[in-house]
Interface confidence: low
């Protein structure tokens, strides 16, 4: 039989109506101010409260922690370190909390942390050791399985004088701590390129979302090591063509599904191999929706309906006749 609670399933310092209590263990501890706590669901929600720091008195039972819609600004080292530790915290959502700095070791002492969402924070300064916790060349493995970093790019005027892509990749690769990562979402980050070594060092990836970026080419990116990859989202980028090497690597991944919608495909002679591949492959989802953007005469033509005669290149003019 399900338990009876004479208080709401969620306890809170503010009124909160929750669904019926489910049959779960009773989980002792108090609820931080401005938060709502469900002992039965092992969940703490401190949502849209304009918190400026992580509550210090988080209950030890917390398995799911939502700290969304706040004004945290900075996550210092050991932001979630407690005595005793939050040993069961498995899912941490910090999205939309105005974080612009995540320091080294911010997520240390969370031995069960499997899902982390930092989306919609303008991360001008993401420490290379944010996820690894130390600057050792090989760190202790992180328990993270899902890392959600959608729309973490700061406004142009707040970016440091360095590559944003490089900053993110440094954090992903530091200490090889994220070898067990299975889902990585990096959508909507204005990425112009993907550093060539990043995927090779994340061998456990099942799901990679790079949608809504500004990727122009995948020429230097290798998918060869991602033998477990199941979904690759490349929608809404600036891709012009996929070349033979990339096509072969994608075709060689046993479980892959690739999403390529809404890219400005250039349908000239360089597209011939990709069109041939598209007609034969089953890995591209919605391949019948892919259309040309350039040249003008090919705009809106469906890639699958093209043949080699359609795909020509204008002759290259000698330099003396070229114009800007």
């Amino acid at each position: 039989s399900s338990p009876t609670s004479s208080a709401s399933s969620f306890s809170s310092s503010a009124p909160f109506l929750a669904s019926a209590v489910s049959a779960q263990p009773p989980l002792p501890d108090q609820c931080p101010a401005l938060c709502e706590c469900s002992e039965a669901a092992r969940t703490v929600k401190c949502v849209n409260r304009n918190l400026t720091e992580v509550p210090t008195d988080l209950p030890a039972y917390v398995r799911n922690l939502f700290l969304t819609g706040n004004q945290l600004a900075v996550l210092p080292a050991g932001a979630f370190a407690r005595r005793p530790p939050l040993a069961e915290l498995a899912a941490l959502n910090l999205s939309g909390s105005r974080l612009d700095e995540v320091r080294a070791g911010a997520f240390e002492h969370l031995p069960s942390l499997r899902q982390l969402d930092l989306s919609h924070n303008p991360l001008a300064d993401l420490s290379p050791f944010a996820f690894s916790g130390s600057n050792a060349s090989v760190s202790a493995p992180s328990p993270l399985v899902e890392l959600i970093l959608n729309h973490i790019v700061p406004p142009e005027d707040e970016r440091q004088n360095r590559s944003f892509e490089g900053m993110v990749v440094a954090a992903l690769l530091a200490g090889r701590a994220l070898q067990g990562l299975r889902r990585l979402e990096l959508a909507s980050n204005h990425f112009l390129y993907l550093p060539r070594d990043v995927l090779a060092q994340l061998p456990s990836l099942r799901h990679l979302d790079l949608s809504n970026n500004s990727l122009v080419s995948l020429t230097y990116v290798s998918f060869r090591n991602l033998t477990h990859l199941e979904s690759l989202h490349l929608e809404d980028n600036a891709l012009k063509v996929l070349h033979n090497g990339t096509l072969a690597e994608l075709q060689g991944l046993p479980h892959i599904r690739v999403f390529l919608d809404n890219n400005p495909w250039v349908c000239d002679c360089h597209m011939a191999d990709m069109v041939t591949w598209l007609k034969e492959t089953e890995v591209v989802q919605g391949k019948d929706r892919l259309t040309c953007a350039y040249p003008e005469k090919m705009r809106n033509r469906v890639l699958l309906e093209l043949n080699s005669a359609d795909l020509d290149c204008d002759p290259i003019l000698p330099p003396s006749l070229q114009t800007s």
């Epitope: 049959a23 989980l27 501890d29 030890a60």
Partner: antibody, heavy 120, light 111 residues
């Protein structure tokens, strides 16, 4: 030293009420969930009720639901069990027990118990 | 409710010999990380005392001749070398959900 001391037991007629207390010392009472567990004469242990550290949540065994009320006063370091509409089958030794912050740790400290006898 | 079934009901073991008590839950009481199963010792006229928590962790101050094992639905308490002071009733208990339930108890005696 952690100590839990129950009181308030006695002989009572069916249908009457009794209030048990459990005085806690030697630890920060307000940080711990607390339970009542009972043991009928010659029988095994039966969990009765639980209250969270901040009194935000209470749970009861089906056998006492609607008749018993668990409460606590953190300023007095005291746990209570209000028992109404008592029945013969409520006769037992009643123990209070402490629940650590991690529920996977079991009930780590128990009082010596107080005896409740429901008899006409 | 989760039903905890202990076996045997009673056990007579010679001093210095091994005693093994089993407990089976009617459904899994383990997550991927932890088992919510505990063992208690109760001597006559005394309250229960926590011996083992989370299936296999020895409570502070408990002699290391006591050990626990198991996950999911099947758990075992072992006394590696029975001492006279170990004569008692032993209970298993889960904390997976409400209501917490206890096994029926196993009485350990000296043969």
């Amino acid at each position: 030293e952690v100590q839990l001391v129950e009181s308030g037991g006695g002989v009572v007629q069916p249908g009457r009420s009794l209030r048990l207390s459990c005085a806690a010392s030697g630890f920060t009472f307000s940080n711990f969930g607390m339970h009542w567990v009972r043991q009928a004469p010659g029988k095994g242990l039966e969990w009765v009720a639980y209250i969270s550290s901040g009194s935000s949540t209470f749970y009861y065994a089906d056998s006492v639901k609607g008749r018993f009320t668990i409460s606590r006063d953190n300023s007095k370091n005291t746990l209570y069990l209000q028992m109404n509409s008592l029945r013969a089958e409520d006769t037992a030794v009643y123990y209070c027990a402490r629940s650590p912050a991690y529920y996977r740790y079991g009930l780590d400290y128990w009082g010596q118990g107080t005896t409740v006898t429901v008899s006409s | 409710d989760i039903v905890m079934t202990q076996s045997p009901d009673s056990l007579a073991v010679s001093l210095g010999e091994r005693a093994t008590i089993n407990c089976r839950a009617s459904q899994s009481v383990s997550s991927s990380t932890f088992s919510y199963m505990h063992w208690y010792q109760q001597k006559p006229g005394q309250p229960p005392k926590l011996l083992i928590y989370s299936s296999s962790n020895l409570e502070s101050g408990v002699p290391d001749r006591f050990s626990g094992s198991g996950s999911g639905t099947d758990f075992t308490l072992t006394i590696s070398s029975l001492q006279a002071e170990d004569v008692a009733v032993y209970y298993c208990q889960h904390s997976w959900e409400i209501p917490y339930t206890f096994g029926g108890g196993t009485k350990v005696e000296i043969k």
